[in-house]
């Protein structure tokens, strides 16, 4: 009786269970009653990352420098090339097909997590007691100056965008 299902790493064709091609190889010829599946290695610029019956290997991803991309990991016959973004840029999507500049955190916000090649800057509002008066992709919220430790008093309260202003204490006459 011809099989209706095949083992793992096999496929059914013409009532025959044929071996799939291993990762890094493409199908040249299905198995027959007389022959085993024939597979060939992918060429240098190509890959297949699964057991397969593909007659064409996939082209390695091209990390286009015009889009701000650079190679993070060179592709092999079994893996695709991994692109990342040049410094100061990050990927627009998980597949990293293009890059955009990291965003800066506006005054009143500080950097919670510095951007990487694959993720944008994460900003957070400066909580009470902290401020940021610059637009920056690196600076965290800074704590207000402690006037007391300088033997000074607060002359102007701080905000999330400004530091406190300290001044001398009023002297008793």
């Amino acid at each position: 009786e011809p099989p209706t299902a095949c083992r793992e790493k096999q496929y059914l064709i013409n009532s025959q269970c044929c071996s799939l091609c291993q990762p890094g190889q493409k199908l040249v010829s299905d198995c027959t009653e007389f022959t085993e599946t024939e597979c060939l290695p992918c060429s240098e610029s190509e890959f297949l990352d699964t057991w397969n019956r593909e007659t064409r290997c996939h082209q390695h991803k091209y990390c286009d420098p015009n889009l701000g991309l650079q190679v993070q990991q060179k592709g092999t016959s079994e893996t695709d090339t991994i692109c990342t973004c040049e410094e100061g840029l990050h990927c627009t999507s998980e597949s990293c097909e293009s890059c955009v500049p990291h965003r800066s955190c506006l005054p009143g916000f500080g950097v919670k997590q510095i951007a990487t090649g694959v993720s944008d800057t994460i900003c957070e509002p400066c909580p009470v007691g902290f401020f940021s008066n610059v637009s920056s992709a690196f600076e965290k919220c800074r704590p207000w100056t402690s006037c007391e430790t300088k033997d000074l008093v607060v002359q102007q309260a701080g905000t999330n965008k400004t530091d406190v202003v300290c001044g001398p204490q009023d002297r008793q006459r």
Partner: antibody, heavy 115, light 112 residues
């Protein structure tokens, strides 16, 4: 239905060349190898080699490798075998065959090599 | 090359009686994938060969069930349970495990 139709009988002189054809129909030509087999008069069979029409890849019996050339023309679903530097021992019936989901044979081409 | 030896060379049989042909290979025909690529076919006078059995024991579609194949490794047998007049011809074994593919010399089945 699957059919392999071979070219007609040939008579050649020693040292000449001959090109036999095998026209396939009834299936997707590039999906299956075409093989060639020799049967000399009153003899058994000898495997010459095969060609994959998908990419032109060949495999050969070393005995025939230096004198046999296998080619295909996918536009007309035809396989060819050219045999060069013919000698009297090449006198035989030559079959083309295809397997995968059944085995199919051409009707054979008779080649006579004689001075 | 793998040498395929068939016996007998000639087999005179009585209609309705069984017949058996042996085929031995000079090395094992067990492929690394677990299959054994030993095949049998028949050639009637003046005709192209016609495959009967593939991979030792699998009958091709349309082949009568009076034909059966068995064996493993290097020893193989084709049996005809009850010979009919249309079974007359030469029977070949062949192997496609090793390149070059090779054939047995043939066994001529004729009616007594």
């Amino acid at each position: 239905q699957v059919q392999l139709v071979q070219s007609g009988a040939e008579v050649k002189k020693p040292g000449a060349s001959v090109k036999l054809s095998c026209k396939a129909s009834g299936y997707t030509f590039i999906s299956y190898y075409i093989y060639w087999v020799k049967q000399a008069p009153g003899q058994g069979l000898e495997w010459i080699g095969g060609i994959n029409p998908r990419n032109g890849g060949t495999n050969f019996n070393e005995k025939f490798k230096s004198r046999a050339t296998l080619t295909v023309d996918t536009s007309i679903s035809t396989a060819y075998m050219e045999l060069s530097r013919l000698r009297s021992e090449d006198t035989a019936v030559y079959y083309c065959t295809r397997h995968g989901n059944g085995v199919y044979w051409g009707q054979g081409t008779t080649l006579t090599v004689s001075s | 090359d793998v040498v395929m030896t068939q016996s007998p060379l000639s087999l005179p049989v009585t209609l309705g009686q069984p017949a058996s042909i042996s085929c031995r290979s000079s090395q094992s025909l067990l492929h690394s994938n677990g299959n054994t690529y030993l095949h049998w076919y028949q050639q009637r006078p003046g005709q192209s060969p016609n495959h009967l059995i593939y991979q030792v024991s699998n009958r091709f579609s349309g082949v009568p069930d009076r034909f059966s194949g068995s064996g493993s490794g290097t020893d193989f047998t084709l049996k005809i349970s009850r010979v009919e007049a249309e079974d007359v011809g030469v029977y070949f074994c062949s192997q496609t495990t090793h390149v070059p593919w090779t054939f047995g010399g043939g066994t001529k089945v004729e009616i007594k």
